[in-house]
Amino acid sequence: EEELQVIQPDKSVLVAAGETATLRCTATSLIPVGPIQWFRGAGPGRELIYNQKEGHFPRVTTVSDLTKRNNMDFSIRIGNITPADAGTYYCVKFRKGSPDDVEFKSGAGTELSVRAKPSAPVVSGPAARATPQHTVSFTCESHGFSPRDITLKWFKNGNELSDFQTNVDPVGESVSYSIHSTAKVVLTREDVHSQVICEVAHVTLQGDPLRGTANLSETIRVPPTLEVTQQPVRAENQVNVTCQVRKFYPQRLQLTWLENGNVSRTETASTVTENKDGTYNWMSWLLVNVSAHRDDVKLTCQVEHDGQPAVSKSHDLKVSAHPKEQGSNTAAENTGSNERNIY
């Protein structure tokens, strides 16, 4: 009778992570008597995957009933495959012996390759906000994919970016891989509504790439422009001065009025108007009682935006042209906030 052969008909098997792998193996004879075992790898460090007769292998099931007389099919199924399961699997026939069974013949091996999807790309921007014309870096990371081949692209508002560097780790063979990319983006004043997108394409995604996004609203700071103007006289001895704070982002802003360098009033921007580009406008006004002043008044609108050093704009108020009203001791009326703000 011809000597037993162990046949593994599949040289390789490709399985998606999470699925079940079927590893086929048949023997050509029932003799010699002894169990079949499956190993991953060869040599002394090989890992036992399944023993026909003993041991605990909760992920493994046999394709056929091994207790059936004359069974020669020793194929197995391994459930819930992960990239860590990749490797070459050997079906090995043992001959009964004492004290231990002896390896008799091995199959040629089946290489199991695992396709694993990349994780959703995570895009992160700089820790601190930056102003227009500055260049900022964004990073994109995705993990756990296999095989190694992967494509990563960057977009800003649908326009592909070219200034980026990408690494796939590790460089050598591994059960799964990670990608890390850093893109440089130049900010403009119109970027409050802009998005930076990292797009990852991989064979496991069937042409439907994964995207990670970052909103530039989290990154940009658009400093305000200030304009202080004097409005027509409201009453014989009152002048209305407005401070227009335009095109700023984010909204966090505090405004202080100074009269000849002395703080007159401080307020925080609350009800603002939003521009089409996502920046904000705000207006504050001050009623100045000119009769309280003998000399010209220097009015300063000082704005502290988003924790940055204050910027200011001044206006010289000429009082000589206005008649003095006796008995007034207030230089400026601290009017109610509704009256102060013009929307």
């Epitope: 890992e47 036992l48 007769k53 003993e54 041991g55 091994l66 004290p99």
Partner: antibody, heavy 113, light 108 residues
Framework: EVQLQQSGAELVKPGASVKLSCTAS????????MHWVKQRTEQGLEWIGR????????KYAPKFQGKATITADTSSNTAYLQLTSLTSEDTAVYYC??????WGQGTTLTVSS | QIVLTQSPAIMSASPGEKVTLTCSAS???????LYWYQQKPGSSPKLWIY???NLASGVPARFSGSGSGTSYSLTISSMEAEDAASYFC?????????FGGGTKLEIK
């Protein structure tokens, strides 16, 4: 559901023999080896031996060679452990086990005159 | 035969404490064939860790196993009252199969 049901407690005299049983349900005992393990009160576990019910092949720990005999009856899906020439040293709980995962509830054997 | 020596034989740990039990083999054991069992008084042993590092079904994630060759260990990252039990290592790499002497783990 896989279960291993062992026979009830035994009280036997020194010098006598006893045969403990382990009946399997939820699987065919031919598909895996059946093991027997000894545990004396407040002590560790000792592997006695195992049987391949498919062909009756057995292996024993040297300490239990000649003391223990393991057999199996595939028609009743049952494995047996026979212990001979009993002494007080054989007083223990005896477990049957399959694939290291499934264990019987244990049979208490007391050897006393 | 392969002799498995467990240490310590008895130990007590406070809740939240990290615990490491060791199992030393007299000759090399392939990691695929090294199992750990938990046993509580009056109960059959339960498979706790198989193939050195795989947790059996229902075993809390605070347990882990590691090792190779002649040195193996079971670790509990943060001791809980329900972990008080005896733990046995077991090898089925070479006949005769053998158990370690066990470690009795108590809660303080």
């Amino acid at each position: 559901e896989v279960q291993l049901q062992q026979s009830g407690a035994e009280l036997v005299k020194p010098g006598a023999s006893v045969k403990l049983s382990c009946t399997a349900s939820g699987f065919n005992i031919k598909d895996s080896y059946m093991h027997w393990v000894k545990q004396r009160t407040e002590q560790g576990l000792e592997w006695i031996g195992r049987i391949d019910p498919e062909d009756g092949e057995t292996k024993y720990a040297p300490k239990f060679q000649g003391k223990a005999t393991i057999t199996a009856d595939t028609s009743s899906n049952t494995a047996y452990l026979q212990l001979t020439s009993l002494t007080s040293e054989d007083t223990a709980v005896y477990y049957c086990a399959r694939r290291g995962f499934y264990w019987g509830q244990g049979t208490t054997l007391t050897v006393s005159s | 035969q392969i002799v498995l020596t467990q240490s310590p034989a008895i130990m007590s740990a406070s809740p939240g404490e990290k615990v490491t039990l060791t199992c030393s083999a007299s000759s090399s054991v392939s990691s695929s064939y090294l199992y750990w069992y938990q046993q509580k008084p009056g109960s059959s042993p339960k498979l706790w860790i198989y193939s050195t590092s795989n947790l059996a079904s229902g075993v809390p994630a605070r347990f882990s196993g590691s090792g190779s060759g002649t040195s193996y260990s079971l670790t509990i990252s943060s001791m809980e009252a329900e972990d008080a039990a005896s733990y046995f290592c077991y090898q089925w790499s070479t006949h005769p199969y053998t158990f370690g002497g066990g470690t009795k783990l108590e809660i303080k």
